[in-house]
Amino acid sequence: MCYGKCARCIGHSLVGLALLCIAANILLYFPNGETKYASENHLSRFVWFFSGIVGGGLLMLLPAFVFIGLEQDDCCGCCGHENCGKRCAMLSSVLAALIGIAGSGYCVIVAALGLAEGPLCLDSLGQWNYTFASTEGQYLLDTSTWSECTEPKHIVEWNVSLFSILLALGGIEFILCLIQVINGVLGGICGFCCSHQQQYDC
């Protein structure tokens, strides 16, 4: 088992996932590709929690770059033992992974709440309302009710798709950070076993 390479793999994955989270969150601000709803403040309250931008995005880049840095070969070591420094680095990566868990957890929770509440839309009564808030998420199973939202166009599909993507991406980030916690603990305790001869591809 090569703990450094595993961490690097996780790091690169997290960068990609973080960028996707940021993109998904930004798209939530532009239902149907229009800017007017953001300027009129006619967006779901959970869009303003920046769960994809901050939680699953920026906050995830910190652990990602820490994990990527773990595989570098110029680790100075300590007490004359090269592996000791690498062990310290692996254990410190656990802290970074915990930050990642917090960020991805935040992203997952907000996305789940956003899905459960449904979008803010102009309902069949001509009011801006959380039309599906009282359905406890049941609206997700009954697409015939989605026409209750008259504006923005396709807002239910837009919200459901993007919050689902954030939920999935946040969930994957959470799992990867959890794996890195285990990887970091094992790497720190068992030692940094990668030799220059071993080549692992992600």
Partner: antibody, heavy 120, light 106 residues
Framework: EVQLVQSGAEVKKPGASVKVSCKAS????????VKWVRQAPGQGLEWMGW????????IYAADFKGRVTMTTDTSTSTAYMELRSLRSDDTAVYYC?????????????WGQGTLVTVSS | EIVLTQSPATLSLSPGERATLSCRAQ?????INWYQQKPGQAPRLLIY???NLASGIPARFSGSGSGRDFTLTISSLEPEDFAVYYC?????????FGGGTKVEIK
Amino acid sequence: EVQLVQSGAEVKKPGASVKVSCKASGYTFTNYGVKWVRQAPGQGLEWMGWINTYTGNPIYAADFKGRVTMTTDTSTSTAYMELRSLRSDDTAVYYCVRFQYGDYRYFDVWGQGTLVTVSS
Amino acid sequence: EIVLTQSPATLSLSPGERATLSCRAQSGISFINWYQQKPGQAPRLLIYGTANLASGIPARFSGSGSGRDFTLTISSLEPEDFAVYYCQQWSSNPLTFGGGTKVEIK
């Protein structure tokens, strides 16, 4: 001046269709909804549904679902209401009405009305 | 469907008198709007949101009420006030109107 101008009176046979137009002027058409109401001779007012002029999404009253189609043409600021399978009890004055979205959703501007007579 | 019952169906009064029109909802609603209609004309908005006077409407018209019971009051009838008055709710679909109260000259 804010106004809604409707098309002229129509006489139709039972089973036929009628399409009433409603041209808006004096305001930004897509900022308000358009509601359709009818009034049979000597009777009260009956709501038929409304259309979101920005998205074109209509909401129909249950009594008219499947028989009515509401559309808009934003390029000419015109709303349309088509009623199919006409019966004699569809004889009424049909009004288009502007309303503002929000808490009270009141109907402040009314068209002059279009009399549709269904007779064999 | 929320049924609105207006009473009385006809109100016979003289100019200068006070008119009180009632609108009762079958179940509790958040607000009501009032309209005036004269023969051969489209209805005209008088009161919106239960108590707010529409633009260009004289101050002799006022609205009040909450829950199920709502009232339109004309403090002193003018000759042009003799017409049919409708209340309307849109707290839930379908939007409904009351049957109307005709205010006629005694």
